[in-house]
């Protein structure tokens, strides 16, 4: 899967929550960021994530599409210079400081269940999605026979009117 351009086709600032309306939050601890899945108190401000959308071409042996076989890839950045990364060895999702061009581990194939309900598939490990496990984000293997609607890999994007601190 090759990214067809070095620049995103668009960027979208949103808060990220689980299918069960728990918020994804990011906290700086001991000079590294931790990711939490938690219920926010009423009126508590939701953390914002910058989603950058890139076009990606299907591998030629995977698709009979020719030039129209495009996917949307996203990177997710909750704060300047930090991006979500897939750690496929540890089956974990981590926040790492990176410089552009970003490594493949920072890219996720976007799947829509509807326009504001999405799943994120690891670019480096097809069939593996960001999901929720024990109040943390983790990488979860989804069998092709399973429906992608399984709730622990579904996330909601909700718009935010605040500016990202990029």
């Amino acid at each position: 899967m090759s990214i067809t351009g070095i620049s995103p086709i668009t960027e979208y600032l949103a808060s990220l929550s689980t299918y069960n309306d728990q918020s994804i939050t990011f906290a700086l601890e001991d000079e590294s960021y931790e990711i939490y899945v938690e219920d926010l108190k009423k009126d508590e401000k939701k953390d914002k994530v910058l989603l950058s959308y890139y076009e990606s071409q299907h591998p030629s042996n995977e698709s009979g599409d020719g030039v129209d076989g495009k996917m949307l890839m996203v990177t997710l950045s909750p704060t300047k210079d930090f991006w979500l990364h897939a750690n496929n060895k540890e089956h974990s999702v981590e926040l790492h400081k990176s410089e552009k061009p970003l490594p493949d581990q920072a890219f996720f194939v976007l799947h829509n269940m509807h326009s504001n309900s999405v799943s994120f598939e690891s670019k480096t490990d097809p069939g593996v999605f960001i999901g929720v496990k024990d109040n943390h984000l983790a990488l979860i293997k989804v069998d092709s026979s399973e429906n992608l609607s399984t709730e622990n890999i579904l996330f909601k994007l909700s718009e935010t009117h605040h500016h990202h601190h990029h």
């Epitope: 009979g64 129209d68 429906n147 609607s149 718009e159």
Partner: antibody, heavy 121, light 106 residues
Amino acid sequence: EVQLVETGGGLVQPGRSLKLSCVASGFTFSNYWMYWIRQAPGMGLEWVSSINNDGGNTYYLDSVKGRFTISRNNAENTVYLQMNSLRSEDTATYYCVKGHYSYSSYSIDYWGQGTLVTVSS
Amino acid sequence: DIQMTQSPSVLSASVGDRVTLSCKASHNINKHLDWYQQKVGEAPKLLIYFTNNLQTGIPSRFSGSGSGTDYTLTISSLQPEDVATYFCFQYNSGWTFGQGTKVEIK
């Protein structure tokens, strides 16, 4: 080359049923959301229904909910629109439309030539 | 539900003119917007996606811009073959078309 060919349109009386079919070629059908969009004579475009790539999620315009059913057969590269209890206001050209990106409901690109449904007594 | 309002409903301009079509959403749609061109008797054709990305094979005189609730399609130099109706389409929340702008040559 992407091709979408709709069939099944025609003249039907109010209250009756009609089933539209759309056969797709030129792309990996099972990767893409598919849509039905209609256009009443001389009017604008109106989204009617959507189905995700594996067929597990379907969405409808409020005025057709409970009357229309979208479905797909990925083995046969075909998407359907079953239309029951048809009304005169359903008269339109119905277009079959392909999603722009694999697995995504964001954006649409290729359209069929459309099939005309006329509901009249 | 998100409503999309296009203006003007009819636009008459001369060949070579710079033409601007407007589309306004009832809520922020986060640049999740396409523009389509429909000529008489034909199916619509995708021109611009995600607000400002030109679809393959579309002439570069077409461009899109906007954010939040306000979006614009610009034809930098109107050509006779651009006579058509232009529709905007949002997919940020559900799917909705604008009512269209008909472009004519003076």
